[in-house]
Interface confidence: medium
Amino acid sequence: MKPGCAAGSPGNEWIFFSTDEITTRYRNTMSNGGLQRSVILSALILLRAVTGFSGDGRAIWSKNPNFTPVNESQLFLYDTFPKNFFWGIGTGALQVEGSWKKDGKGPSIWDHFIHTHLKNVSSTNGSSDSYIFLEKDLSALDFIGVSFYQFSISWPRLFPDGIVTVANAKGLQYYSTLLDALVLRNIEPIVTLYHWDLPLALQEKYGGWKNDTIIDIFNDYATYCFQMFGDRVKYWITIHNPYLVAWHGYGTGMHAPGEKGNLAAVYTVGHNLIKAHSKVWHNYNTHFRPHQKGWLSITLGSHWIEPNRSENTMDIFKCQQSMVSVLGWFANPIHGDGDYPEGMRKKLFSVLPIFSEAEKHEMRGTADFFAFSFGPNNFKPLNTMAKMGQNVSLNLREALNWIKLEYNNPRILIAENGWFTDSRVKTEDTTAIYMMKNFLSQVLQAIRLDEIRVFGYTAWSLLDGFEWQDAYTIRRGLFYVDFNSKQKERKPKSSAHYYKQIIRENGFSL
């Protein structure tokens, strides 16, 4: 195997596009005067206190005596999580609701993508049918004993063509009933506004997220949700894993809308997603937070990667570049200095849009906590990995340390974590337990040994369901659902029993 944090790692995927697609344009170079330099330096020093230095995360791979996150004595930690640790579980609307055109719901880009791109899948109607069997979901939540339930609202179920006019009454009723039921059970709702199911009409009329018109439309939709549901929702997520929306939706074509090969479109989409998130955060902060007193963030997903040789600086450069180009792409504007990472700006200057100074100011700090997703969607689809000698790693603890170092130790909600099993596995999902124990152990070590401020954990997922490009070939639920059955009973898997015990004991007891 070729040494290094090899190309083919997420963040270096642009090498799979022809170089013709990266057209050259000149950058403006500024000659800074002495006064300007001193002002910039002062601002940087101030910013350093707020954001940490970009590049600090590199220490994790270096042989740095001040940072050794894993040593032999720490391989497993028998301890409890902090008191009031926030235990939860999550689902995505498109993955579990079913009923894709029932009761006035409009089609989403994924409903369309399923029909045009996925073999042997006719629709999500064969899924867990959460839209029909809401009570069964609530019973499953009761069984586990979670503190919160993270779910997403299907935009086209509320507004069939995406435009905020009169809401679809049945859709509104469904989410209102769900929220009321959660509040009644003392389960905190964490609501995601956009988990990839863009109304198809917005794709067809505007080109979807490629068009900045969507920013205001998304803000209108968010405003409606805040108005209708904000009295019961204290935690909001604007967008789930925008990296995958941009990269796989418009780069590889593996996700809806299935466009591929246009690198400029990938980064335009990313740009619009960031601006949409920022607009919604400011909207919530100004108009809703004063009386609803909630928190709002965006879920950012990432892989983790290790150099084959920690003493080789070039390998470490590549690892840092890989993380910066995936997680930093979105985290830097929102949790960092308000702009794209410097390395991305340099390397992708011909296709990466530019934030104005006013926009940088507007983007910066538009998250009340760091919502982090760590799961197979950021690893598994990259079939280039084995070929290119990449040394990927499921080390959630080190990924959390990287976030701590890069973004000045933010409060972190693990907004999605878990692995997957083969579709043939029913309730005896021993691999899922092994993975969950491993991940939870890493989170506990991050909290207790590295002083990382993780305040909550979202196991993914509550139910087996539609798993995007993998459709129904894998399962991620803690509850087994027979998709061919009429009643879609939720049967607790071994992992559900295990997670229930973890929650009850608030960690690992000896």
Epitope: I15, M314, F317, G343, K347
Partner: antibody, heavy 123, light 107 residues
Framework: QVTLKESGPVLVKPTETLTLTCTVS??????????VSWIRQPPGKALEWLTH???????SYSTSLKSRLTISKDTSKSQVVLSMTNMDPVDTATYYC???????????????WGQGTTVTVSS | DIQMTQSPSSLSASIGDRVTITCQAS??????LNWYQQKPGKAPKLLIY???NLETGVPSRFSGSGSGTDFTFTISSLQPEDIATYYC?????????FGGGTKVEIR
């Protein structure tokens, strides 16, 4: 304005040690994105990378010359020093000191070069 | 060490000609490749980074392409001031290495 200037002897005898100093201005050697490399070029021949010092004092050396090279820096004086032991006539070359911009650990390139200093090895 | 093989070692072309130089790496280096121009008696100058990105202020007649092991450097229309030796340089792995150079002359 960023500049690098090499200084040192123009003539050294075989078996002696060559010591070259690179004095930089316009940027700081402690800047986490900057490093300095030494590169040489024998008359009429290609460029050959010798060594590099990163901002955190990590060092890297050419495989074939590793045993003869030492690189160090004095941040307060804005200087990088190259030592090369056991000089031989084949080491006659122009020696360049080069700034390497790594853009917060995205290696980007040798963007500013010194004018070079010609060193002749002869008895 | 990664060997960089540049060809041709020298070429002669007329003003306005399209000039192409190739560089082959002994193993895959992704797009971790730069191109430098060195005029007689001068220090080299960075022209292209990451295989295809033009450095600020470099004329658009210069371009680069390729990834993995095979790379190409092109001057779309040769100008008198382009008389120089051109070097490829890999930074995929340490030690850093250069190609043997291609000397471009006017016919």
């Amino acid at each position: 304005q960023v500049t690098l200037k090499e200084s040192g002897p123009v003539l050294v005898k075989p078996t002696e040690t060559l010591t070259l100093t690179c004095t930089v201005s316009g940027f700081s050697l402690s800047n986490p994105r900057m490093g300095v490399s030494w590169i040489r070029q024998p008359p009429g021949k290609a460029l050959e990378w010798l060594t590099h010092i990163f901002s955190n004092d990590e060092k890297s050396y050419s495989t074939s010359l590793k045993s003869r090279l030492t690189i160090s820096k004095d941040t307060s004086k804005s200087q990088v020093v190259l030592s090369m032991t056991n000089m031989d006539p084949v080491d006659t070359a122009t020696y360049y000191c080069v700034r390497v911009d790594t853009l917060n650990y995205h290696y980007y390139g040798m963007d500013v070069w010194g004018q070079g200093t010609t060193v002749t090895v002869s008895s | 060490d990664i060997q960089m093989t540049q060809s041709p070692s020298s070429l002669s072309a007329s003003i306005g000609d399209r000039v192409t130089i190739t560089c082959q790496a002994s193993q895959g280096i992704s797009n971790y490749l730069n191109w430098y121009q060195q005029k007689p008696g001068k220090a080299p100058k960075l022209l292209i980074y990451d295989a295809s990105n033009l450095e600020t202020g470099v004329p658009s007649r210069f371009s680069g392409s390729g990834s993995g092991t095979d790379f190409t450097f092109t001057i779309s229309s040769l100008q008198p001031e382009d008389i120089a030796t051109y070097y490829c340089h890999q930074y995929d792995d340490l030690p850093l290495t250069f190609g043997g150079g291609t000397k471009v002359e006017i016919r």
